[in-house]
């Protein structure tokens, strides 16, 4: 219950919004963990950076990387080249000493690439408004900084 | 073109169960969630849940839970829905419905009329 | 669960009008909204989804807007084919919630 979805294709990027109340939760790092089992603890995958004020610095896991947009509320996790064993249930964590607050509940369901013949049943080809782009990728919801951009432009 | 083909009308006693199917050609079927829908006669739409074929598995709204049970059969492309213990409250419209990668469901079955009467 | 409010469930118009037909969800979903459209004895059909993203095929006067919790769906100029009922779906959150639909009619 009080679970967002998000769909992506195997061997593709899934890209996973998680908005939050940016002044309820500053000066919070974040993290997304793994749900293991219904009721069993939450697996740490990956953290944002340790100084908040780098949070929208890209940190990476394997194939799981995070940034937060501490301004605009939302923390996106990315997941490279989505495996079958990716799916499942997960969190978005908001973290303060040794607790941590699940921002958002999230189940990641894998499908199959269309254009991969292994198991595709008929051919799929993306209709007149959507690019393979548009169809494989869940953007996030609000604008979050990328990596290597500073939060403010210097001022002179 | 993608057509979701909903099997026919059935009339069934209560305590009964019952099991639909929904054949979905002309797209890759395990490369999108099947869902299906409750609409009772005059009345508003109601999520059941959804099989992601490629997977097996299943995401339930609680409220059907005991209710329905959602297969699929990749070889014919077909999705299923079993609904056991019926009663007259189970008398509906059942639609099986593709969700697409924007999310919202782009394609819908005609429909699966579900009468419970002894 | 989230609730979808659909403020009217039905609707006197005119056929060249401009239609605005409101959702209200409980809590914020962040735009991930869909409207349809559904006719006597037929299936719904997808409009809109992602609150403002027309669907292929989709006549240009439609239209969605909105944010947070509150969403319109717009007619431009009703046409005698856009006489049907129109509901709205959250996929925000499971389990995925519609509203209880609003239904146009002639005056």
């Known amino acids: 219950h009080n679970t967002t979805v998000f769909q992506g294709v195997e061997g593709q990027s899934l890209q996973v919004s998680c908005p939050y109340d940016s002044m309820k939760h500053w000066g919070r790092r974040k993290a997304w963990c793994r749900q293991l089992g219904e009721k069993g603890p939450c697996q740490r995958v990956v953290s944002t950076h340790n100084l908040w004020l780098l949070s929208f610095l890209r940190r990476r896991n394997g194939s799981t990387a995070i940034t937060d947009d501490t301004l605009g509320g939302t923390l996106t996790i990315t997941l490279r080249n989505l495996q079958p064993h990716d799916a499942g249930f997960y969190q978005c964590q908001s973290l303060h000493g040794s607790e941590a607050d699940t921002l958002r509940k999230v189940l990641v369901e894998v499908l199959a690439d269309p254009l991969d013949h292994r198991d595709a049943g008929d051919l799929w080809v993306p209709g007149e408004s959507e690019s393979f782009e548009d169809a494989h990728v869940e953007h996030s919801i609000s604008r979050s900084l990328l990596e290597g951009e500073i939060p403010f432009p210097p001022t002179s | 073109e993608v057509q979701l083909q909903q099997s026919g009308p059935e009339l069934v006693k209560p305590g009964a169960s019952v099991k639909m199917s929904c054949k979905a050609p002309?797209?890759?079927?395990?490369?999108?969630?099947m869902n299906w829908v409750k609409q009772k006669p005059g009345q508003g739409l109601e999520w059941i849940g959804y099989?992601?074929?490629?997977?097996?598995?299943?995401n339930y709204n609680e409220k059907f839970k005991d209710k329905a049970t959602l297969t699929s059969d990749k070889s014919s492309s077909t999705a299923y829905m079993e609904l056991r213990s019926l009663t007259s409250e189970d008398s509906a419209v059942y639609f099986c419905?593709?969700?697409?990668?924007?999310?919202?469901?782009?394609?819908w079955g005609q429909g699966t009329t579900l009468t419970v009467s002894s | 669960d989230i609730q979808m409010t659909q403020s009217s469930s039905s609707f006197s118009v005119s056929l060249g009008d401009r239609v605005t037909i409101t959702c209200k969800a409980s809590?914020?979903?962040?735009?991930?909204l869909a409207w349809y459209q559904q006719k006597p004895g037929n299936a719904p059909r997808l409009l809109i989804s992602g609150a403002t993203s027309l669907e292929t095929g989709v006549p240009s006067r439609f239209s969605g807007s909105g944010s947070g919790k509150d969403y319109t769906l717009s007619i431009t100029s009703l046409q005698t084919e856009d006489v049907a009922t129109y509901s709205c779906?959250?996929?925000?959150?499971?389990?995925?919630?519609f509203g209880g639909g609003t239904k146009l009619e002639i005056k």
């Open positions: 779906q959250q996929y925000w959150s499971t389990p995925w919630t």
């Open positions: 099989i992601n074929p490629y997977s097996a598995g299943s």
């Open positions: 419905a593709r969700s697409s990668y924007r999310y919202g469901f782009d394609y």
């Open positions: 809590e914020d979903i962040y735009n991930r």
């Open positions: 002309g797209y890759s079927f395990t490369s999108y969630l």
